[in-house]
Every structure is written in C-alpha cells, then in structure tokens.
Interface confidence: low
C-alpha cells in the first residue's frame, strides 16, 4: 500500500499545450477492452408492487418526500419491456451490462426465504439473454433499493444484523445466477448511501443531521461488502472463478492555488474524506484512512486489528463511479474550500498513486442532460468524448490499468433526488407513452461508434503531404490600420543652421550666426515608425505585406475637399520602402474594428454604412487612393470583413442588412472605377476580404445540425459572396430563411430586394478571392426569436473541450480550412483564392508554441488544397505582425517590437516553399523570384515623393 | 389554486354530437405529470370513466363508447375537449372532468381534482 | 375487461370503523385509489395509491391491498362521512381507468 496520492498536485512540468495528445488523444483502446453500459434497477424497472415485488426504502421515500413525484411505478419499465433493453443493448453492441438486482424483488422483506418466483424469473431470463448475446453481465447486488421492511425492523444499514441478512442475499445470487455471471459488484456507491441517506437525508431513506449514524452505515456497508467477498471467495470462486468488488465514487478536486501546500492538503483530505473511506478498509490498509480517524474519532467506528486484516484486500479489482450523483450537491465539508473539476483522468491517477496501481473498472461514467432533451443530447456526447479520452490518456500515456468502462446509462428514469427533471439514459424514453421504446440519442450513437472503433480514429484529416507551394505564391503577413505618422519623426538635414554645444555652460545649444549647411530633401526613412516596420518585415522574411489605409486620417472630411498628403505620402513611403527589400504590399483600404469603425467623423454623423451616400463617398476615396499609390500596389482590398460589420449595426437585422447592402456596393462601385479607370495602366487586381470561418455541426448525428452549419456558412460567407462571386444577388437559401422565419412571424427582417441595375452593378466584381481564416465553429440548431442578425440564423455555437484552444477561444482546427477551400471552389468556380489573415492569439512572448503549432497545421492543410485538391491558392498572410498593447496576442512581434520564436519557425517553410521532400530543390529562378520586384523599384524611382 | 370547469350544451337531441369543454387553471396541459379524464355519472348510477388524454397528447378510450368518442387538448387555451357523437336518451348523466397526477409512468395517483360537472340530458 | 366488485352497501355506528372492500383480479399488484361523493357534489380524492392520502384528508381514512381485494377503512366514523365510495385503478395491461360500482355507506342512528 502506497498512499502517495498528494502527488497528483504538483503540477506536470513537460505539459506542452501544443501536443495535443495531452488534450485529446486519437489512439485505440488496447485491444480486449472491456465496454459497457448500465443500469439501476430502482430506476429502470417500474413495477414496484407488480408480481409480489415488496416496497423498497426508495418506494417509500418518494411518497414521503418527494411530493411531485409519485412512484417509480412507470419509469422506463424495464421489468415489462426487457427484450427493448435487449435491442437496445444489441444496437450499442456493447460487451458488458452492468445492471442490478432489485433485492425486494427477490426477496420482498428482505429476508432469504423462499424467493418471489416471477423476481428470479425475470433476472433469470435476463442473464440467459445476456449469455446468448455474448454480453457479460456485471451484476449489482445493492443499488440502494434496500427492502423497506428491512429499514422497519432494523433500522436499516444502522443495525448491524443487516450485515448477515445482505450475506444470506448474496449467497442466494451467487447459487442461482453464478453460473452465469462473472463479475460482481457487492454495493454501488456506498458513500451516497451513508451521506446523503443519513446525513443531508437527501436520498432514502432520508434521515439527516446525525454524523455517528452516516459513519455507522459506511461501516456495516464496508463489513457488509467484506463478509460478502470472504464467502465468494471462500465458497463460490473456485467452481464459478468470478471476480467481485464494491463500486466507489468520488469527485476530483484541484487546489485553489498549485503551489500552495495548505491547499494541496485541503485536496488530500477532500479525496480521502469521500472516496478514501471506503477505499482504504478495503484496497488500502484496512482502515479508515489516518485524516479522518483524526478529525472523526468521536463518531468514526474501530476497526479492530483482526478486521482490519479481514478488510483488506477484499475486493478484486477497483469499480470506480465518476458522475453527477458524487458532484452535485456536493456537500461543502468534501470541499474543503477548493474547486471542483470534472477531470477524471486525474483521478485515476489519485488512485493508481494512493493504491498501488490496481486493474480499475470504471463502473460508472457520464453526466446528465435537462429532461426536455429528447434524442438530440449534443453535449452528452461532448462530455462522453472528454472523459473517455481521459481515460485514453490515463491507460496510454500514465500507463493506468482501467480495463473496461460503464457508460451511465442505458437509459433515461428515475434519477434519485432529481426523480424524471434530468436524463442520463444513451436512449431516450418518453415516460408518459404507453410502448415506453427505446429512442437511441445522439450519445447512444456515438458511443456505438467509439466501441466499433474501440477508440477513436483520426478519420478528420488525412496525414500530412510532402510539397512545395508554387515559385509565385505569396508569403505575407497582415498587419491592422497603419496610423500614419503626420511629420517625419528625424528632422536630421532639414535645418540649414549650425550649432555649438555649451558643454561647460548652460548645457544649451548656441546657433552659429552667418552660417548656412545644405539641407537635404525630406526621405521615407525619415519616418520612425517605417524603420520600425521595415526592420520588422525584414526579420519575416516575407514576399507580401499587407497593411491598411485609415481613410479617415487620408479624408478628414470624408470627401476630396481635404486631402491629407502627408498620409498619403507615409503610406507611399511604407510601399516603396518595402519594394527595396523585395516586399510587395496588399493595400486595404478600409478595415473596420469593432471599437471603432475607421469611417471619417462627417460619414460617421450621417449614420455611416446606413446610409447609401457613404458607398459613393467610398468610391471617391479608393479612387485616390488608386491614383496615388496604385503604380505601386498591384494587390488591393477594398473592405475587410464587412460580413462582420453586423456586430456593429446589430440594433437590427435590417439595419445589418442595409448597411452589408451598402458595403456591397461601394466594394462594387470601387471595383468598377479600377477597371473603367486604372486597370489597364497599373494591371492590379481588387477584391474584398471575407472572414470565413470554416462550420461543422456540433452534433453530427443530427441533421438539424448539418444543416445548420450549411446555414452558418450562407449567413457568413456567401452572403457577401453570392452576389458578388455570382449572382449579382443573395443566395437564395439565405433570403428564403430569413422569409420563412417572417412568416413565422419569428422576424421581421428582410433582406433589401435588388433592382436589376444593382445586381448588374455587383456582379463579376472580383479579381480574387480573399478570405480570412481563423478556426473552425461548431453549430448547432436553435430556433430563435427575435429580429437580429444573429437570432435570424438560428445558430448556436459549441465550444468542444476536448480541443486545443487559444486563450480568446479559438479552437485549431487545421482540416476546416482545405474543407473551407474545397467548399469556396465548389460553389463559386476555379479562381485565384488568397488566405489573407490567418492566425491564432498565443499568450507566449517569447516561445510562442501555439502559433508555430497552428502555421505549421494550417499551412500543411493549405498544401494539400494545392497540391490533392487542385485549388488555386495564390498566398497565405500570417495575421498578424505585431500586437496591439492589452488586446489578444496575435503578432510575431510584442507591442514593444520584440521578435517571437515562430518568426524563424515561418522564415524556414517559406524558405523551404512549404514542406519538401528531403534534399529536394526549394529554389525558384531567379527572373522568376525578382521580376515583380525590379519592375516596382524602377517605378519608385521614376515617382517624386 | 387549481380548478377544472366543464362547460356544453345542457340539452342535446338524439343522434347528435356533444361536445364538452373542460377549462383547467393553475397548472399547464403541457406537464408531463398531468393528463385529464372524462368521466359521466347517470343519474343515481356509478361513475364510469370515458376517456384521458396525456401531457404528451397520447389518448385512451373506454372500449365500450372507442367509436363515438374524440379527446383532445388545446395548450395554449388551456382545454381539453371531448366530443360524443350519436347521442342517445341512456347517455344523459352529469360529465365531469378530472385531472390525473401521473407518476413516472403513465400510472398515476387518482384523480386528485375535479370539476363540478354539467348535466346533459339527452332528450327530442 | 377489467371489472372491480364493491358491495352496494356498508351500514356502520358512529364511532365504529367501516371497511369498504373492491375486488379484482390480482388487485394487489395495481394500485387503487379511492373517491368519497356525497349527493349533488362531485367525488373527492380521499385515498391514492392503495393507503396514502392526499393533504386535508382525515387520519381516519387508510386502505390497503394485497391479493384480490383492496380496503378502505373508515376508522370512529362520523355522520359526515355517510357518502358513496368508489374504488378506481389504472388497469395496466388494457390501458384503462376501471372503476368500482360504488358503495354507500350509511350511518346509522
């Protein structure tokens, strides 16, 4: 016995969050894995008094205290429906059923008599079916349906008598089902019996407040399990060769602060208050654990020393319960004041170091769902998925011996104190039907899969490719809005006068009279903040650059009337300048915040992208722009992002449309102005950038979710680009939503209605397409009320736990982009496709692990759009070049310039042009590499500034 | 407080149909623990059940009067109607309606509220 | 069809107990629910689910079952308790409510 549980807190120092492995482990299960499911009989059989069953101590506390239920009488009515459990069984196809022998169906005083005929009936024909299906039957022989009769006369599990009473029960099971059953589990969760039976009188029977008596039950329990293990052990296990244990459930607890060794007891004590009291008479010494002898010796029973020795070692593996009955409520004394946590995997670990790593069965596993969920149980099978990878993870990587795992439950019923207000069944049963059928949920789906797949499989992405991206694709980075510096920072040459310092003196300088020095014109690297710029993207090692123009700071006024040259002139300087080390820029001239919408205050007052003036007004302003730096820019944005200016103007789902109607067309009517007007003399290309964000259903057994994620996908992307890309119009499928749900009379929005002229005017308008890539969202169905943007898509999203996130959320989800890729080809046609921000936040300053972890994914997944998928990508911009002080960390460099370690990380795939083969050729010729780049420096020389 | 209330014609002729309204306040039809019985008492006879309808709109009849009967519920107004067709001079009687507690199952624990009932006589 | 059998008639002194039975094949295995209706009133829940009895129902009112039959048991009974009883179960297995022909119980003197 070891006993070295306290261990578990200190904290793991090689824990990387970017081996996802210590997140969620794709991997099987080894390969004789024992999987199952189960069930309680007090809350699955119904027929309480039916075929001379006798009133259980449950029976009666239902009618006694728990007043807006009547009995268990219906439930799921497995006593009447066991072939629906056999189907049900059959369809998981499960390897094990643990389920449990109501004791007063067999005995309906309690007392080993002659046994209820139709009782042993029924669990006879149960295990026999069992046995015929080739399932195991894991056999309960107390899940807290003590005989009411025995509570009477007794006292129940107060009185000690009922020690021998229970043996003579589980004799009689032994010599009637033991030829049959190879597994067996004394009692389930004896803590919650004593507890909340006798000490919050929560459960039946429902006494309360008296702490000898809650310690009184768990003694005869552990002794009651104890003699019940000697007498199998002794009479039963050499002809039936079974194995037999006792269920435990416990909590998991982390300490307030991880350092703290006050804390780190407080956990300690936490654990061995609820599950060591039972686990240490039993798998540890034989006692009660030393904490609470301490603590508890006015009211904790003794063991003497002969039963301590008796104790242990009396159960033949470790049955382990993880799940809501042991957290909620969970009693403040287990709290000790530090902060429950739902992770299993270290509690598995608590146990592997506090007994001496034994073979665990996890005989119970799940949580719950509110009672209105009928089939559709999405986070069911989220929480299934994070506990069962943590059990991956605690046989695979802390080489834990779990051998098999108990779902919880086959089906929905009678849950304790809850009565039918939650769910914990995999099939959902409606209880006031008459046919009570078996309905497999999400979960039951799901979990069919796991135990087909005995794991889980990597089936969402395909291994990784060796290639390269082709010589003229565009390595960039994306920077925000560039505020542009309004004098030169360095007046060095402009002065024409000399000056003597009084070094001795006043420390003044002193202007040198008559004389004059020949100044120099003003020059771009005048400009601090472009040296800053430069040095930066110089360390990037980057072919493109792409930044934004702030039109209010170029247009004051929001019209031509007032020209900011000296804003055009910085920007022209950033172009130019990065021109000379081979960087050409992406100009976007428009990009919008949340914080702060970027339009010019005069645009701004006369209610901004509402009002349609402001598209021609944005027409004038690009075509300044156009005029004043389009020799040198070939790549521009006109918009970024408008599909998420709807966070702004989401005082309604029509304002939000009007002003995306808006957005729309000054996107359009500056695209027309540079082909009418600049095209043919500067050749660029215009697009607008679209975020695009990639969506699967959250539940993907659910066709509402499937399509929800389509709807997502509508809503967000192909609501900017169907009329634009395509039609000239909104997708179909998005207005027709938006009218159905106004019929409804759930919204009153509306989506504008195009003229001809207008769909004239939007359509074709793109050169390329530009998108903004981030994550992966996963959605789900929910109808909304309401006239929001927002509400109208009936879509909520779901954070799936078991992913590696960034700390704003994002999940990394390589595969959504190449699925994001495949899916703009296939709806809009083979054309130019830019990624033109891509990035993810990362707390590090320095070793910045996360974001060299999402390039390296993103960008192999971007390859195999290429290289598998044919997709005509043209460039990836990393987002973001540098942070913005108290905002999320997205840049490569810190808000005070310092560089990251994922900028050499980036400088090698780009050196490399993706990911070669081995002592393969990554060089592109040389006219090949430069010709852009002398073509723009002859023009910077040409252009005064 | 709870109350059930039937409401219908006092007087009906022969081989026409009745129909009853029961209005229930206090508690929802949407319940999963609720559902509500007709039942009729002919005069100085014993109660004889008619017909229930269940939360989840699931109905049961009596076999002897299946044919000629329809329950049916409208949440939203809070009613349940049950209409009898074919009438004849043996179906007058008072017709209650009831509400039923429904425990995990579909059994439950009597009818444990009923309205005052309104007398149908059936008569040309 | 399920049929449950109740004398017509039970006569009891005041102060005495009544035992009203209903009888019914295995009608232990249901449960019964008993109704008190006095003249021109609509019947009232006085025993649910073979003994227990809803809130503002007398002590003196209990019932049980087992077997074939089921009782209530009006214990030092009261002239205001002279009513009609009927018994009802939900018969499971035909999906209906059954119930009893009702008994009256008179109070003598």
């Known amino acids: 016995f070891s006993g070295d549980g306290r261990a578990i807190w200190s904290k793991n120092p090689n824990f990387t969050p970017v081996n996802e492995s210590q997140l969620f482990l794709y991997d099987t299960f080894p390969k004789n894995f024992f999987w199952g499911i189960g069930t309680g009989a007090l809350q699955v059989e119904g027929s309480w008094k039916k075929d001379g069953k006798g009133p259980s101590i449950w029976d009666h506390f239902i009618h006694t205290h728990l007043k807006n239920v009547s009995s268990t009488n219906g439930s799921s009515d497995s006593y009447i429906f066991l072939e629906k459990d056999l189907s049900a069984l059959d369809f998981i196809g499960v390897s094990f059923y643990q389920f449990s022998i109501s004791w007063p169906r067999l005995f309906p005083d309690g007392i080993v008599t002659v046994a209820n005929a139709k009782g042993l009936q029924y669990y006879s024909t149960l295990l026999d079916a069992l046995v015929l299906r080739n399932i195991e039957p894991i056999v309960t022989l107390y899940h807290w349906d003590l005989p009411l009769a025995l509570q009477e006369k007794y006292g129940g599990w107060k009185n000690d008598t009922i020690i021998d009473i229970f043996n003579d029960y589980a004799t009689y099971c032994f010599q009637m089902f033991g030829d049959r059953v190879k597994y067996w589990i004394t009692i389930h969760n004896p803590y919650l019996v004593a507890w909340h039976g006798y000490g919050t009188g929560m459960h039946a029977p429902g006494e309360k407040g008296n702490l000898a008596a809650v310690y009184t039950v768990g003694h005869n329990l552990i002794k009651a399990h104890s003699k019940v293990w000697h007498n199998y052990n002794t009479h039963f296990r050499p002809h039936q060769k079974g194995w037999l244990s006792i269920t435990l459930g416990s909590h998991w607890i982390e300490p307030n602060r991880s350092e703290n060794t006050m804390d780190i007891f407080k956990c300690q004590q936490s654990m061995v208050s609820v599950l060591g009291w039972f686990a240490n008479p039993i798998h540890g010494d034989g006692d009660y654990p030393e904490g609470m002898r301490k603590k508890l010796f006015s009211v904790l029973p003794i063991f003497s020393e002969a039963e301590k020795h008796e104790m242990r070692g009396t159960a033949d593996f470790f049955a382990f319960s993880f799940g809501p009955n042991n957290f909620k409520p969970l009693n403040t004394m287990a709290k000790m004041g530090q902060n429950v946590s739902l992770n299993l995997r270290e509690a598995l670990n608590w146990i592997k170091l506090e007994y001496n790593n034994p073979r665990i069965l996890i005989a119970e596993n799940g949580w719950f769902t509110d009672s209105r969920v009928k089939t559709e149980d999405t986070t069911a099978i989220y929480m299934m998925k994070n506990f069962l990878s943590q059990v991956l993870q605690a046989i695979r990587l802390d080489e834990i011996r779990v051998f098999g795992y108990t779902a919880w439950s086959l089906l929905d019923g009678f849950e304790w104190q809850d009565a039918y207000t939650i769910r914990r069944g995999l099939f959902y049963v409606d209880f006031n039907s008459k046919q009570k059928e078996r309905k497999p949920k999400s979960s039951a789906h799901y979990y069919k899969q796991i135990i087909r797949e005995n794991g889980f499989s990597l089936k969402e992405s395909t291994p990784d490719v060796q290639g390269q991206f082709p010589c003229d694709f565009s390595w960039g980075v994306t920077e925000s809005v560039l505020k542009p510096e309004s004098v030169a920072s360095s007046p060095q040459f402009s002065d024409p006068h000399l000056y003597v310092w009084n070094a001795t003196g006043n420390r003044l300088l002193h202007r040198v009279e008559g004389v004059r020095l020949k100044t120099r014109p003003a020059q771009c690297t005048d400009f601090v903040n472009i040296k800053k710029q430069l040095e930066m993207l110089a360390r990037m090692k980057v072919t493109h650059y792409r930044f934004a123009l702030d039109w209010a700071s170029v247009l004051p006024t929001g019209n031509l009337s007032a020209v900011n040259r000296q804003a055009l002139r910085y920007y022209r300087c950033v172009v130019s300048e990065g021109l000379k080390l081979g960087i050409s820029a992406m100009v976007t001239l428009y990009y919008p915040t949340h914080a702060h919408l970027g339009l010019p205050e005069p645009l701004l007052h006369a209610d901004g992208w509402l009002n349609p003036s402001t598209a021609e007004a944005f027409q004038a302003y690009a075509g300044l722009c156009f005029q004043e730096l389009g020799d040198l820019v070939k790549l521009w944005i006109t918009i970024n992002e408008p599909n998420r200016l709807s966070d702004i103007y989401n005082r309604s789902g029509n304002d939000t449309y009007g002003a995306a109607h808006n957005l729309l067309v000054a996107h359009a009517l500056a695209w027309r102005l540079y082909d009418r007007q600049f095209r043919p003399s500067q050749r660029g290309a215009v697009s607008l950038s679209l975020h695009a964000d990639w969506a699967e259903p959250a539940n993907p057994y659910a066709d509402s979710h499937w399509r929800a994620a389509e709807r997502f996908l509508q809503f967000e992307i192909a609501w900017f680009a169907e009329p634009l890309f395509k039609t000239g119009d909104y997708p179909a499928a998005m207005r027709e939503y938006i009218a159905s749900k106004h019929r409804r009379g759930l919204s009153s929005s509306a989506l504008p209605r195009l003229t001809e002229a207008e769909r004239r005017l939007l359509k074709g308008t793109v050169d390329f397409c530009a998108l903004n890539h981030f994550t992966t969202r996963f959605v789900m169905h929910e109808q909304l009320a309401g006239s929001r943007y927002d509400s109208d898509r009936d879509i909520q999203f779901l954070q799936d736990i078991t992913r590696l996130s960034s700390p704003t959320r994002l999940a990394v989800i390589p595969w959504g982009v190449r699925k994001l890729l495949r899916w703009v080809r296939r709806n809009y046609g083979d054309m130019d496709i830019y990624i033109t921000a891509s990035g993810i936040d990362d707390q590090a300053l320095e070793d910045d692990r996360l974001r060299k972890y999402y390039l390296g994914k993103y960008l192999q997944e971007v390859l195999k759009a290429y290289l598998i998928d044919k997709v005509r990508i043209k460039g990836y911009y990393a987002f973001k070049l540098a942070e913005e002080k108290s905002k999320p960390r997205f840049g490569f460099f810190t808000s005070d310039f310092k560089a990251k370690s994922s900028i050499q990380f980036y400088n090698k795939v780009i050196s490399s042009r993706g990911f070669p083969f081995e002592n393969s050729s990554s060089r592109c010729s040389q006219t090949q590499e430069n010709t852009e780049c002398t073509v723009c420096l002859f023009l910077v020389q040409k252009k005064p500034l | 407080q709870v109350t059930l209330k039937e409401s219908g014609p006092v007087l009906v002729k022969p081989t026409e149909t009745l129909t009853l309204t029961c209005t229930v306040s206090?508690?929802?039809?949407?319940?999963?623990?609720?559902?509500v019985s007709w039942i009729r008492q002919p005069p100085g006879k014993a109660l004889e059940w008619l017909a229930h309808?269940?939360?989840?709109?699931?109905?049961s009849y009596s076999t002897s009067l299946k044919s000629r009967l329809t329950i049916s519920k409208d949440t939203s107004k809070s009613q349940v109607v049950l209409i009898m067709t074919n009438m004849d001079p043996v179906d007058t009687a008072t017709y209650y309606c009831?509400?039923?507690?429904?425990?995990?199952?579909?059994?439950?624990?009597?009818?444990?509220?009923w309205g005052q009932g309104t007398t149908v006589t059936v008569s040309s | 069809s399920y049929v449950l059998t109740q004398p017509p008639s039970v006569s009891v002194a005041p102060g005495q107990t009544a035992r009203i039975t209903c009888g019914g094949n295995?009608?232990?295995?249901?449960?019964v629910h008993w109704y008190q209706q006095k003249p021109g009133q609509a019947p009232v829940l006085v025993v649910y689910?073979?003994?227990d009895r809803p809130s503002g129902i007398p002590e003196r009112f209990s019932g049980s079952n087992s077997g074939n039959t089921a009782t209530l048991t009006i214990s030092r009974v009261e002239a205001g308790d002279e009513a009609d009883y009927y018994c009802?179960?939900?018969?499971?297995?035909?999906?209906?409510?059954?119930f009893g022909g009702g008994t009256k119980l008179t109070v003598l003197g």
């Open positions: 009831a509400r039923s507690v429904v425990t995990g199952g579909y059994y439950y624990d009597g009818m444990d509220v």
């Open positions: 206090g508690f929802s039809l949407n319940n999963a623990r609720m559902g």
């Open positions: 309808i269940f939360s989840n709109d699931e109905k």
């Open positions: 295995n009608i232990g295995s249901e449960s």
């Open positions: 689910d073979d003994s």
């Open positions: 009802q179960v939900w018969h499971g297995n035909s999906d209906h409510v059954v």
